[in-house]
């Protein structure tokens, strides 16, 4: 299996945005790579987003995706937006080298993303 590294913990910003780097130990230069972000919470795993990209090109997520990303060599910089406290969980980076063959698969240990909903601003009387 291909080794995938990602940070253990990330704290989302007050705007509900979290970014982390997913690095894979590529045996060479795959021309087509698929990156999937999975969320594990309460022993359930769900797919958050996925993108397939050609080496040297940008990652393209679906238009309605909450993820964006850029790639550089064997590193993918992922950003997840629109997070709320209930989205706190373990976000796992899965990397697949799709082409050329053979197929390689690597799954990271996950990044625990903590999301804290901002306190509502108190009404002020003037």
């Amino acid at each position: 299996a291909m080794h995938v590294a990602q940070p253990a913990v990330v704290l989302a910003s007050s705007r509900g945005i979290a970014s982390f780097v997913c690095e894979y130990a590529s045996p060479g230069k795959a021309t087509e790579v698929r990156v999937t972000v999975l969320r594990q919470a309460d022993s359930q795993v769900t797919e958050v987003c996925a993108a397939t990209y050609m080496m040297g090109n940008e990652l393209t997520f679906l238009d309605d995706s909450i993820c964006t990303g850029t790639s550089s060599g064997n590193q993918v910089n992922l950003t997840i937006q629109g997070l709320r406290a209930m989205d706190t969980g373990l976000y796992i980076c899965k990397v697949e080298l799709m082409y050329p063959p053979p197929y390689y698969l690597g799954i990271g240990n996950g990044t625990q993303i903590y999301v804290i909903d901002p306190e509502p601003c108190p009404d002020s009387d003037f």
Epitope: S26, G28, K29, A30, G73, N74, P100, P101, P102
Partner: antibody, heavy 118, light 107 residues
């Protein structure tokens, strides 16, 4: 486990052609990866010569100009090196090796020594 | 072609010591660098790939580091079986190229 084994001439006369065979066991050369020839000169300098891909594609080191050809026999799971118009400068140990596309070499043959001399 | 320069042809060490073998690329190769160990009469064996990842079965006393143009293979707690020649290799750009090698010897 994947194993690669080189075989071929040990002595070639100048201006003649050298032909080497790499026999692969434990993995089909059409299933994936790139199948390379690398040589090591006396003094241990390594030079990558070229590859034949799982799909039959080739790429050669430009330094060898038009002297090199790498072919395969998929039925025997073998690939071959042919180097034309050899000189004493081609005296080396020749290795076959496997890599992922533009990747590091994970499996190597044990090498075969070739001497160019009249 | 990308030239991989291993400036030290020989390095002397003692068992138990730590030693660092360096390699410099003539242009940026990112992290696409591997290291091989070769003993007399044998083929090169992969130690490190993608700059810092150990190949399967390689002891953790071997570590790789660097990026861009400067790369290092560090062997800590050198053992007698580590006395060999070490080659760096760039696989960022074809034609793939190797360093000239650094031979590790006993003091």
């Amino acid at each position: 486990d994947v194993q690669l084994q080189e075989s071929g001439q040990g002595l070639v006369k100048p201006s003649q052609s050298l032909s080497l065979t790499c026999s692969v066991t434990g993995y089909s050369i059409t299933s994936g990866y790139y199948w390379n020839w690398i040589r090591q000169f006396p003094g241990n300098k390594l030079e990558w010569l070229g590859y034949i891909g799982y799909d039959g594609s080739n790429y050669y080191n430009p330094s060898l100009k038009n002297r090199i050809s790498i072919t395969r026999d998929t039925s025997k799971n073998q690939f071959f090196l042919k180097l034309n118009s050899v000189t004493s400068e081609d005296t080396a140990t020749y290795f076959c090796a496997r890599n992922y596309y533009s990747g590091y070499f994970d499996f190597w043959g044990q090498g075969t020594t070739l001497t160019v001399s009249s | 072609d990308i030239v991989m320069t291993q400036s030290q042809k020989f390095m002397s060490t003692s068992v138990g010591d730590s030693v660092s073998v360096t390699c410099k690329a003539s242009q940026n190769v990112g992290t696409y660098v591997a290291w091989y160990q070769q003993k007399p009469g044998q083929s090169p064996k992969p130690l490190i790939y993608s700059t810092s990842y150990r190949y399967s079965g390689v002891p953790d006393r071997f570590t790789g580091s660097g990026s861009g143009t400067d790369f290092t293979l560090t062997i800590s707690n050198v053992q007698s079986e580590d006395l060999a020649e070490y080659f760096c290799h760039q696989y960022d750009t074809y034609p793939l190229t190797f360093g000239a090698g650094t031979k590790l010897e006993l003091k």
